[in-house]
Interface confidence: low
């Protein structure tokens, strides 16, 4: 009877579009066939996937966030078959280009400005804001009460992922009109 196999990895937190990961099915055994599955499905045929070492090692080249799935290895001989517990790959990625919401760019004087910035990233990124180039708080949400036309300008959200070493940003123009002079929306 074959033992329950396990999966070892040479990189537990690979970075998207940069790193490769090699999974190895343990233990090494003679006259044994090694198989692999992803999220309960057979391996897709992909140039980024390579089986080696008698199919005992599965290498993922140039990992992407879509590779963050559950990997299972199986072993089989002429007597029995068994498979490992799943190992979920934690792919570090981002931050992607952030999105500022709501999308409105025109506001009435006296309204509250409540801008939220979001960027897809693993782990979650650090957020910071600049208004007309001047650094503001390091928060995901920027709140300014009772804005006036003095608050016109460019609002930039900056995101940084310390794990991937990557940064991103987006800039949004905000126009504040005196009350009653613009069809713009109040926040």
């Amino acid at each position: 009877e074959l033992p329950k196999p396990s999966i070892s990895s040479n990189n537990s937190k690979p970075v998207e579009d940069k790193d490769a990961v090699a999974f190895t099915c343990e233990p090494e055994a003679q006259n044994t066939t090694y198989l692999w599955w992803v999220n309960g499905q057979s391996l897709p045929v992909s140039p980024r996937l390579q089986l080696s070492n008698g199919n005992r090692t599965l290498t993922l080249f140039n990992v992407t966030r879509n590779d963050a799935r559950a990997y299972v290895c199986g072993i089989q001989n002429s007597v029995s078959a068994n498979r490992s517990d799943p190992v979920t790959l934690d792919v570090l990625y981002g931050p992607d280009t952030p999105i500022i919401s709501p999308p409105d760019s025109s506001y009435l004087s006296g309204a509250n400005l409540n801008l939220s910035c979001h960027s897809a990233s693993n782990p979650s990124p650090q957020y910071s804001w600049r208004i007309n180039g001047i650094p503001q708080q390091h928060t995901q949400v920027l709140f300014i009460a009772k804005i006036t036309p003095n608050n016109n300008g460019t609002y930039a959200c900056f995101v940084s992922n310390l794990a991937t070493g990557r940064n991103n940003s987006i800039v949004k123009s905000i126009t504040v009109s005196a009350s009653g002079t613009s069809p713009g929306l109040s926040a």
Epitope: G40, N55, G74, R83
Partner: nanobody, 124 residues
Framework: QLQLVESGGGLVQPGGSLRLSCAVS????????IGWIRQAPGKEREGVSC????????NYADSVKGRFTISRDNAKNTVYLQMNSLKPEDTAVYYC?????????????????RGQGTQVTVSS
Amino acid sequence: QLQLVESGGGLVQPGGSLRLSCAVSGDRWDYYAIGWIRQAPGKEREGVSCISSSGRTTNYADSVKGRFTISRDNAKNTVYLQMNSLKPEDTAVYYCSTEFTGWDRCGFDEYDHRGQGTQVTVSS
């Protein structure tokens, strides 16, 4: 290992149709590619068709392409081989076979386990 039981064979006239079934029992059925192979008297075993564990990938021997269709019903643990436009040269014992595989593809060469077979005879 899986247990395989084929059925659906019989005597049919040229141009006729048959539907073979392969009932599969055992653990981890969805980890196996399933294939049909056939052996005519005095001839080598020939791979006919196969279907991957997910059912997304199929393969056919050139001699049956366009006439045979393989499918699998994972809810019923059954693989089917629909055989149309049968010819006398399709006469053989048809075996269902399995491959415990991690690839979402199938082939005819590596199957090491098969059932007892079902006889298909095409004759007028």
